[in-house]
Interface confidence: medium
Amino acid sequence: FPQDRPFEDTCHGNPSHYYDKAVRRCCYRCPMGLFPTQQCPQRPTDCRKQCEPDYYLDEADRCTACVTCSRDDLVEKTPCAWNSSRVCECRPGMFCSTSAVNSCARCFFHSVCPAGMIVKFPGTAQKNTVCEPASPGVSPACASPENCKEPSSGTIPQAKPTPVSPATSSASTMPVRGGTRLAQEAASKLTRAPDSPSSVGRPSSDPGLSPTQPCPEGSGDCRKQCEPDYYLDEAGRCTACVSCSRDDLVEKTPCAWNSSRTCECRPGMICATSATNSCARCVPYPICAAETVTKPQDMAEKDTTFEAPPLGTQPDCNPTPENGEAPASTSPTQSLLVDSQASKTLPIPTSAPVALSSTGKPVLDAG
């Protein structure tokens, strides 16, 4: 185009710029080793380093390991991006009691409203369930027969949440039936928002890949690279993705150029001790304790919660569709294997935290 000649001429003889025919404008030439954050950089701030996959470029221009959501009680909220760490939150059905940078150090199961109470605010990844006294008569907020009983004396606004044992504990929390994988799959559908850092104004090249040259002239596909298994953090540092190499872990989400890998316990197991983006200790998935049934929910922020069975009913903890409790989408592959010892249980009050001993038998957790 002849009309482009004046624009092209403005780049000529200026070693710090080049003319990009695709966008028909003069672009800033990123120095060797730096890569543009957009197709036609205009200034030095439009250039950055590259990191290995699972590392992100931090504020100090260093490649930093994205946190890992590999603990079984965590799910990825936002992915590891070139300029920001992955963010983890408690998995559906749990809330964070002890926060950590870009993650949660300790998750608890949402409380179940005791008899005579109904849910005022459902639990989220950040907050526990809030209960309120049931009004006389049937309330539309009643989620189950228990919640619609007449208020009894001495009811509390919130049942004691069930903790996931910290790394220092040898006991693991009795997990909720319904399948962590199902919950995580539901949650993963909500992880990346359209405006997440990794999807806005970034080159859409394959994660972790880079141009065949440090920065081909006129190319927009230039950014700081990280070694595989590292991702580019917000400050431009390569940050380590977690590894799912242990036999009891499987990869949930891959390590990307701008986000960490996430691991979860393999089918048939549940996480007893969480770790960022992974699980430090997986245990066989137990079945429900006697006198306990579960209420599966399929929303990311509302997972299965322990609940006393309605009067006159028998607990059925078999994760099968004919139960009437399990979601219709439950498939055989999502029916989790159970250690036979876990079924030899005694009745346990639902308000008490339940944990597994090293033998797989439930024990009461003193708190």
Partner: antibody
């Protein structure tokens, strides 16, 4: 199995340059980034930088930016490190190392090291 | 840069003893810590990564632990062949940095 074979010892004069090699075998050379690590006698380890052999992308520890130059030759599956303007401080064993992606974050594979001695 | 400090240059132990080697990071490294064993005249050998994950083929007497800034490598029952220098390394952020090493001596 993964093997990293480094070139032999180098004796150099102050101000000179040396170029050492690290030949990779047992894996696809372009799939693994190559790291370089320095170890002075009786001292700790220092990360120099790394190169992505598939793209020749390099990133350096700021301390070694003007000292080391990393290159790679895909055809021979060999990574190189050149050290320039040598001083006695550069006398050390230099290792090439790589990771086992997806299963380890530390340096799982190391070359045997190249000893560089700078002496007048 | 992140500084990794190994406060003990030397540790003396006996065969069969349990020993813990410590490492402190100058800032939180989110468990992205590796441990290496280096015997005289040899290249370093990876033992542990992500603070507690044993590398392939590493005997289970080697255990890593820690979080935040404090990490340790424990040998549950020291063997004669464990005589070596042990280095911690943060693989959290570039530039990757190593501790100064702890030499394990057998009494």
């Amino acid at each position: 199995q993964v093997q990293l074979q480094q070139s032999g010892a180098e004796l150099a004069k102050p101000g000179a340059s040396v170029k050492m090699s690290c030949k990779a075998s047992g894996y696809t050379f372009t799939s693994y980034w190559m790291h370089w690590v320095k170890q002075r006698p009786g001292q700790d380890l220092e990360w120099i930088g790394y190169i992505n052999p598939s793209t020749d992308y390099t990133d350096y520890n700021q301390k070694f930016k003007d000292k080391a130059t990393l290159t790679a030759d895909k055809s021979s599956s060999t990574a190189y490190m050149q050290l320039s303007s040598l001083t006695s401080e550069d006398s050390a064993v230099y290792y090439c190392a790589t990771r086992h992606y997806g299963s380890s974050y530390g340096f799982a594979y190391w070359g045997q090291g190249t000893l560089v001695t700078v002496s007048a | 840069d992140i500084v990794m400090t190994q406060s003990h240059k030397f540790m003396s132990t006996s065969v069969g003893d349990r020993v813990s080697i410590t490492c402190k990071a100058s800032q939180d490294v989110s468990t992205a810590v590796a441990w290496y064993q280096q015997k005289p005249g040899q290249s370093p050998k990876l033992l542990i990564y992500w603070a507690s994950t044993r590398h392939t083929g590493v005997p289970d007497r080697f255990t890593g632990s820690g979080s935040g800034t404090d990490y340790s490598l424990t040998i549950s029952s020291v063997q004669a062949e464990d005589l070596a220098v042990y280095y911690c390394q943060q693989h959290y952020r570039t530039p990757f940095t190593f501790g100064s090493g702890t030499k394990l001596e057998i009494k």
